[in-house]
């Protein structure tokens, strides 16, 4: 199933001669023209949304953590779960909102590349069981951020935001993550349509800079839902 | 912004080759790998190959694996797909994507392949 591919394929099989790896994967997106969505993926529709599978944070969407649904549940079986909004209870960062943090037990406010950066997809796709196995190296190795002394250039491999150079994000390229430039006014970004919607992305894109926010640009309003184009604007 | 334009598409019949190329222009053309994805009719888009110069190693999904290789001339900015032993369901639009630092992913308009039994 799609899910245990994007489990499978889940950020872990970097060799280390390349360095670190993952960030967060993105959510659900609108389309801009000349990017090109999946139609029919049951994984995007509103009405069709299924509970998506982990194992820890990093597999769910930048807006998700990873916990059992049911409090004192079952620690094996866990889902990716909405995040919790400022000034809700939280257990760790990760359960807070891009934006805020875990502090004393409830989610305050941080500032925008603190503790876990927003990433956006460019290009979501569904794979079905074509997946591939990178180079022959295992999917279950996992590489620890603190191995890696100096914060990765554009280009690099990461695990998070934070791994990467000021400016820069962390961000899915085919299997991997590597550091990407954080989005400057008037360049194309993507919105995030709504939480909990997964595909396998293959390129993301960071999100926009300090003051920037990702907009829909003003002459395309008159466009299709699933044609307009997002771009990053001035507050 | 970039352009990539996709050819070498045509008419095969099963158990032949086709070499798709997918050339970058625009202006001066950066990027950190290039993937070729597919569309039959009334299907999902679905990822083929990739080449990640960034990080100096390909991918190839499993229904292609064996059967189709990609590569780059980085003298021409083009990547290829040589595709063989092609298929009745490798039938599809072809096409190619990059991804780029200015975080722009640009896409061609799609090259159709369509292999007979």
């Known amino acids: 199933t799609l899910n245990s591919v994007l489990n499978s394929n889940a950020i872990k099989n970097l060799p280390p001669p390349l360095g670190g790896a993952a960030g967060h994967p993105g959510s659900a997106v609108s389309a801009a023209p000349g990017i090109l969505y999946p139609g029919g993926n049951k994984y995007q529709t509103i009405d069709n949304y299924q509970p998506y599978p982990c194992a820890e944070d990093e597999e769910c969407g930048t807006d998700e953590y990873c916990a059992s649904p049911t409090r004192g549940g079952d620690a094996g079986v866990q889902i990716c779960l909405a995040c919790r909004k400022r000034r809700k209870r939280c257990m760790r960062h990760a359960m807070c909102c891009p934006g805020n943090y875990c502090k004393n037990g409830i989610c305050v406010s941080s500032d925008q590349n603190h503790f876990r950066g927003e990433i956006e997809e460019t290009i979501t796709e569904s794979f079905g069981n074509d997946h591939s196995t990178l180079d022959g190296y295992s999917r279950r190795t996992t590489l620890s951020s603190k191995m890696y002394h100096t914060k990765g250039q554009e280009g690099s491999v990461c695990l998070r935001s934070s791994d990467c150079a000021s400016g820069l994000c962390c961000a899915r390229h085919f299997w991997s993550k590597i550091c990407k430039p954080v989005l400057k006014e008037g360049q194309v970004c993507t919105k995030h349509r709504r939480k909990g919607s997964h595909g396998l992305e293959i390129f993301q894109r960071c999100y926009c800079g300090e003051g920037l926010s990702c907009r829909i640009q003003k002459d395309h309003h008159q466009a299709s839902n699933s044609s307009r184009l997002h771009t990053c604007q001035r507050h | 912004e970039v352009q990539l334009v996709e050819s070498g598409g045509g008419l095969v019949q099963a158990g032949g080759s086709l070499r798709l190329s997918c050339a970058a222009s625009?202006?001066?053309?950066?990027?950190?790998?290039m993937g070729w994805f597919r569309q039959a009719p009334g299907k999902e888009r679905e990822f083929v190959a990739g080449?990640?110069?960034?990080?100096?190693?390909?991918y190839c999904a499993d229904s292609v694996k064996g059967r189709f290789t990609i590569s780059r001339d980085n003298a021409k900015n083009t990547v290829y797909l040589q595709m063989n032993s092609l298929k009745p369901e490798d039938t599809a639009v072809y096409y190619c994507?990059?991804?780029?630092?200015?975080?722009?992913?640009?896409w061609g308009q799609g090259t159709q392949v369509t292999v007979s039994s």
């Open positions: 994507a990059s991804d780029g630092p200015d975080a722009y992913n640009s």
């Open positions: 625009g202006r001066t053309f950066s990027s950190y790998g």
């Open positions: 080449i990640s110069w960034t990080l100096g190693r390909t």
